[in-house]
Amino acid sequence: GILELAGTVGCVGPRTPIAYMKYGCFCGLGGHGQPRDAIDWCCHGHDCCYTRAEEAGCSPKTERYSWQCVNQSVLCGPAENKCQELLCKCDQEIANCLAQTEYNLKYLFYPQFLCEPDSPKCD
């Protein structure tokens, strides 16, 4: 769920999760266009991960799962079901992805009308 996403990003990364709430074309609710930088690519990948999970019948935004933050690393589990495992992996991936990026202030509160209608395909 959203709480876990914020928690995992905060666990691994050097920045508050709030820094990604309205960033580039993909960080925040929804998203379309060409990702603007490495952070935006992380968010695009996470959108793809959530979409795959949704297609499998999971509810990414609302399903809770268990995880631990150990030495700035996300440890998933114990999972009660496959969705919890999948969603924790999605959030773990974006947390690790974002932790390796540089922050470009010019993409914070980026105007959505500048984002193209078409998006890169998911892997």
């Epitope: 019948g57 079901n81 495992e85």
Partner: antibody, heavy 118, light 107 residues
Framework: QVTLKESGPGILHPSQTLSLTCSFS??????????VGWVRQPSGKGQEWLAH???????YYNPPLKSRLTISKDPSKNQVFLTIPNVNTANTATYYC??????????WGQGTTLTVSS | DIQMNQSPSSLSASLGDTITISCHAS??????LSWYQQKPGNIPKLLIY???NLHTGVPSRFSGSGSGTGFTFTISSLQPEDIATYFC?????????FGGGTKLELK
């Protein structure tokens, strides 16, 4: 159209090994999010979940039965297998193969009946 | 394991009636409850998933509701082809577990 069909020995003697095969069509077990599971139902009783296997080869076994069950798959042949060694009369039941998603059973096979009798 | 308590175990109704079946989970299963129909000698069929979502091709007279531990399955305007056994299944926590079933008969 998704179909699943179970095949098994029908009758076994106590201490023999049960080998079940599920042959399916209409989906691939290489598809993200899909799994195949086994359920059994003794006559006049409720269903019991045995085991399932996912597209990514992750396997789940019902804990009390874990040491006695083996589930495997051959996605190229669209088949899933379940073995239970050393059966006894408590294993007499109808065994169903199912297509599953993470939270529910989407499709069931017709079932295969096993009788364990000395 | 999560226990699923389904009631009633049997039910007599007339054509055109509205019938209701309940399923109670021993712990919170959020919305992860499914309902199935099984006719004698036939394969069980998924009717409803995620508590209230109709599976493809299922008539709209079937409906489901509930969340947490209490769930309800309803058939409005009972048809002859609805005579069957109905059972619920929780999908919150493995192993999947099932209700004991409700055998629906005509009065």
């Amino acid at each position: 159209q998704v179909t699943l069909k179970e095949s098994g020995p029908g009758i076994l003697h106590p201490s023999q090994t049960l080998s079940l095969t599920c042959s399916f069509s209409g989906f691939s077990l290489n598809t993200f999010g899909l799994g195949v599971g086994w359920v059994r139902q003794p006559s006049g009783k409720g269903q019991e979940w045995l085991a399932h296997i996912w597209w990514d080869d992750d396997r789940y076994y019902n804990p009390p039965l874990k040491s006695r069950l083996t589930i495997s798959k051959d996605p190229s042949k669209n088949q899933v297998f379940l073995t239970i060694p050393n059966v006894n009369t408590a294993n007499t039941a109808t065994y169903y193969c199912t297509q599953i998603l993470p939270h529910w059973v989407a499709y069931w096979g017709q079932g295969t009946t096993l009788t364990v009798s000395s | 394991d999560i226990q699923m308590n389904q009631s009633p175990s049997s039910l007599s109704a007339s054509l055109g009636d509205t019938i209701t079946i309940s399923c109670h989970a021993s712990q919170n299963i959020n919305v992860w409850l499914s309902w199935y129909q099984q006719k004698p000698g036939n394969i069980p069929k998924l009717l409803i998933y995620k508590a209230s979502n109709l599976h493809t091709g299922v008539p709209s007279r079937f409906s489901g509701s509930g969340s947490g531990t209490g769930f309800t399955f309803t058939i409005s305007s009972l048809q002859p082809e609805d005579i069957a056994t109905y059972f619920c299944q929780q999908g919150q926590s493995y192993p999947f577990t099932f209700g004991g079933g409700t055998k629906l008969e005509l009065k």
